[in-house]
Amino acid sequence: KAMHVAQPAVVLANSRGTASFVCEYASPGKATEVRVTVLRQADSQVTEVCAATYMMGNELTFLDDSICTGTSSGNQVNLTIQGLRAMDTGLYICKVELMYPPPYYMGIGNGTQIYVIDPEPCPDSD
């Protein structure tokens, strides 16, 4: 009856501070409206990074000022987080909620540890 959410254990952000991972959920019912939230856990504090609600078969739409983008395909959501810096290294948890039709279901992944390494500044050229 519980909803299982799977996500990779570790992801390394690229040199431009962008990290992508797949959040996959096993839906117990036929949901038509799904909400996906990315949460960051650091020092036992949890903060919301971004959230999007989408209709099955439609694209995810995050708010315009969100650092997240994403696409959906069936029970998979491909999430991309941009603008990351070394200080943003941490555990990023994918939370999936089946919002419609009833009943409501919630699933929480174990988290993806995202490592961000700030690029070395380019040496001055003469």
């Epitope: 519980a2 909803m3 117990p28 009943p103 409501y104 919630m106 929480i108």
Partner: antibody, heavy 118, light 108 residues
Framework: QVQLVESGGGVVQPGRSLRLSCVAS????????MNWVRQAPGKGLEWVAV????????FYADSVKGRFTISRDNSKNTLYLEMNSLRAEDTAVYYC???????????WGQGTLVTVSS | EIVLTQSPGTLSLSPGERATLSCRAS???????LAWYQQKPGQAPRLLIH???SRATGIPDRFSGSGSGPDFTLTISRLEPEDFAVYYC?????????FGPGTKVDIK
């Protein structure tokens, strides 16, 4: 600090209506689901309803479906419970509770007593 | 609807003793979505444990949660005078969210 304060309880006759309010402070209200839970005198806890985020998605216990309406005003950080066709068995302390990021209920308000009696 | 059953209904113990409270679900509930609450007379419930094992902020370590599948346990290792109260388990993974009927821990 995170705080919830309920109001609007009182004595009401069977068949009449009442609206409860819960004012939230100390957190970003529209990032959280909000619940009503009730407790009849000397009894256990009974979940009543939940409303999520923007307020479009709502779920109810069978015992109140069709009679109670949960709503929220995110601009006022306020949760509501409109109770119609009240019955004696609706007599209870009504608590509002936030669904934290993982779904558990924390914190809770202090509760407001609703007594349905003729 | 997931029905939660708690046992025993009442537990009579002395301060310093160990309390073991049980919560059983009518169908398998993931430990991720199981919470315990404490309620004292005239007060609102207070979150003790979430995710079956994790103590809420400010909860002393004499409280611990365990279990999986349909069976969960709340243990109070050494009862303090302030621990005598009613304890409820709850599942919050799917609607309707449900509570157990409660276990009252009173002074022997």
């Amino acid at each position: 600090q995170v705080q919830l304060v309920e109001s609007g309880g009182g004595v009401v006759q069977p068949g009449r209506s009442l609206r409860l309010s819960c004012v939230a402070s100390g957190f970003t209200f529209n990032n959280y689901g909000m619940n009503w839970v009730r407790q009849a005198p000397g009894k256990g806890l009974e979940w009543v309803a939940v409303i999520w985020y923007g307020g479009r998605n709502k779920f109810y216990a069978d015992s109140v479906k069709g009679r109670f309406t949960i709503s929220r005003d995110n601009s006022k950080n306020t949760l509501y419970l409109e109770m119609n066709s009240l019955r004696a068995e609706d007599t209870a302390v009504y608590y509002c509770a936030r669904a934290d990021w993982g779904g558990w209920f924390d914190p809770w308000g202090q509760g407001t007593l609703v007594t349905v009696s003729s | 609807e997931i029905v939660l059953t708690q046992s025993p209904g009442t537990l009579s113990l002395s301060p310093g003793e160990r309390a073991t409270l049980s919560c059983r679900a009518s169908q398998s509930v993931s430990s991720t979505y199981l919470a315990w609450y404490q309620q004292k007379p005239g007060q609102a419930p207070r979150l003790l444990i979430h995710g079956a094992f994790s103590r809420a902020t400010g909860i002393p370590d004499r409280f611990s949660g365990s279990g999986s599948g349909p069976d969960f346990t709340l243990t109070i290792s050494r009862l303090e005078p302030e621990d005598f109260a009613v304890y409820y388990c709850q599942q919050y993974g799917t609607s309707p969210f449900t509570f157990g009927p409660g276990t009252k821990v009173d002074i022997k």
